[in-house]
């Protein structure tokens, strides 16, 4: 964005922000704008929150159109109350082995993550907290309405998927590289982030992906067959360009995305790749931003839920990228 | 009643100075840019610079970058616009203006201060 | 970017209708896509006072015989039915670009 021509904001009155977001001049110190916050895009017109000592991550110069809301190097995180250096490793439940980075935190399950679809033998699988156990074992329900149980079933196939092994040496390096987090929208183009020590000198970085689960303009439900409560991954009908801060890719793509549920159930990505997509935005410039594409959805009733702190962020997380 | 009252001009020689400015009332100062705009005798008007909420951006005519300067006083209200080595082609009626800074620029003008450079 | 008008004068009888029209040297659209493209009436030994911005949009408390119009590098101002409180300077001013400029001025009398 060219700061060089005259201010002019937008026609409605200056935005009123979320509690704890502060009101900040755009990048061109033109008009006010509520700061994106940790882990949000950001462009020069969009900027991050200078207050919680926040910057713009452009990454390479080549890609200095948007960015990823990071946080200054040595920043310390605040996790379930507690504050940790950067660079802290802290486990944060018997579930999770987390790790502070520059204001941002990446755990890792200690548990099996597996995500188990339905099944002839267990049509209904359910994690359930077994007492004197920290992990969460699966179990199969009875079905409650025995119709829904029929042909359809052989469909269905047992599909476990595993993080990266956390215990990868190499050269003297103990490799880590935590889970994709979940991405930062529900639909629409969002972020994903994850840490990792898997470089040349073994030290944690913090790696980000655009992500889309879904577009936000689909009527998904719509698309549910009669007597059926989901749609796993819903065929988009024609190829795709994405769209990012009114950049353009320069491909199209026919891509997956996760459908939905009628039940209370969710549908995620269960496998996913990351791939380069280059954008080309209005005045002509190129930028490559890594994006990650859906290989397979799961729906599941393991929805974030809000009693455990990490529990509600991490089932949303994407397993088994292939990346 | 929204009101701009402009203040501080007056005869001066070639090469002095002058410190023009603008009080404002009826409106939440902070939350619109402000401008000054002037008139040479007989002529039509010309933008001189604008400066946004709270001063960290000033935008000048590229020819009194130099010697201009516009500030402001978001604690008292107020706009000012500090002339340096002024000439006599600086000779005008000094507008203070509000800018809303969105749909439209100068909505509220000021009655005006007349500088005058002469020897 | 310099602004053009014409007529430079423009002596109408009341009730008529006055056009006056304002040519700019390039293209106003500012990069957000708006045309910052304004109207302003400064009336004998008054301080201007804003009329139309945004090419089409009239300021609060603007009479609706006041319209205007175009697009690109023309536009046009119009007074459908001219009063006598009308007289005076009309200014067009672009704030697309730097720098701001207004355009030299059309007198409108009254015949």
């Known amino acids: 964005q060219n700061c060089s021509g005259p201010c002019r904001c937008p026609d409605e009155p200056a935005p009123r922000c979320p509690a704890g977001v502060s009101l900040v001049l755009d990048g061109c110190g033109c008009c006010r704008v509520c700061a994106k916050q940790l882990g949000e895009l950001c462009t020069e017109r969009d900027p991050c929150d200078p207050h919680k000592g926040l910057f713009c991550d452009f990454g390479s110069p080549a890609n200095r159109k948007i960015g990823v809301c990071t946080a200054k190097d040595g920043a310390p995180c605040i996790f379930g109350g507690t504050v940790y250096r950067s660079g802290e490793s802290f486990q944060s439940s018997c579930k999770y082995q987390c790790t502070c980075l520059d204001g941002a935190v990446g755990c890792m399950p200690l548990c099996s993550m597996d995500v188990r679809l339905p099944s002839p033998d267990c049509p209904f699988p359910r994690r359930v907290k077994l007492p004197g156990k920290c992990c969460e074992e699966w179990v199969c329900d009875e079905p409650k309405d025995q119709t829904v149980v029929g042909p359809a079933l052989a469909a269905y196939r047992l599909e476990d998927t595993f993080g990266p092994d956390p215990t990868m040496i190499r050269a003297n390096c103990l490799v880590q590289t935590t889970e994709w987090s979940a991405c930062s929208k529900t639909c629409g183009m969002g972020i994903s982030t994850r840490v990792t020590n898997d470089n040349a000198s073994c030290r944690l970085e913090k790696q980000s992906r655009l992500c889309m689960v879904r577009p936000c303009e689909a009527d998904l439900e719509e698309n549910i067959k009669k007597g059926k409560k989901c749609i796993r991954t819903p065929k988009i009908s024609k190829p795709i360009k994405f769209e990012l801060s009114g950049c353009t890719s320069m491909k199209t793509y026919r891509a997956k995305f996760c459908g939905v549920c009628t039940d209370g159930r969710c549908c995620t990505p269960h496998r996913t790749t990351t791939l380069p997509v280059e954008f080309k935005c209005p005045d002509g410039e190129v930028m490559k931003k890594n994006m990650m594409f859906i290989k397979t959805c799961a729906c599941h009733y393991n929805c974030p839920g809000d009693n455990d702190i990490f529990e509600s962020l991490y089932y949303r997380k994407m397993y088994g990228d292939m990346a | 009643e929204v009101q701009l009252v402009e203040s501080g001009g007056g005869l001066v020689q070639p090469g002095g100075s002058l410190r023009l400015s603008c009080a404002a009332s009826?409106?939440?100062?902070?939350?619109?840019?402000m401008a000054w705009v002037r008139q040479a005798p007989g002529k039509g008007l010309e933008w001189v610079a604008n400066?946004?909420?709270?001063?960290?951006?000033?935008d000048l005519l590229a020819s009194l970058k130099s010697r201009f300067t516009i500030s402001r006083d978001n604690a008292k209200n107020s706009v000012y616009l500090q002339m340096n080595s002024l000439r006599a082609e600086d000779t005008a009626v000094y507008y203070c203006?509000?800018?809303?800074?969105?749909?439209?620029?100068?909505?509220?003008w000021g009655a005006g201060t007349t500088v005058t450079v002469s020897s | 970017v310099v602004m053009t008008q014409t007529p430079l004068s423009l002596s109408v009888s009341l009730g008529d209708q006055a056009s006056i029209s304002c040519k700019s040297s390039?293209?106003?659209?500012?990069?957000?896509?708006?045309?910052?493209l304004e109207w302003y009436l400064q009336k004998p030994g008054q301080s201007p006072q804003l009329l139309i911005y945004?090419?089409?949009s009239r300021a609060s408390g603007v009479p609706d015989r006041f319209s205007g119009s175009g697009s690109g590098t023309d536009f046009t101002l119009k007074i459908s039915r001219v009063e006598a409180e009308d007289l005076g300077v009309y200014y067009c001013?672009?704030?697309?670009?730097?720098?701001?400029?207004f355009g030299q001025g059309t007198k409108l009398e009254i015949k």
């Open positions: 203006a509000r800018d809303t800074s969105r749909g439209s620029y100068f909505d509220v």
């Open positions: 009826g409106f939440t100062f902070s939350d619109y840019y």
């Open positions: 400066i946004n909420y709270y001063g960290s951006r000033t």
């Open positions: 390039q293209s106003i659209v500012h990069y957000n896509e708006k045309t910052y």
């Open positions: 945004k090419v089409s």
């Open positions: 001013f672009q704030g697309s670009h730097f720098p701001l400029t």
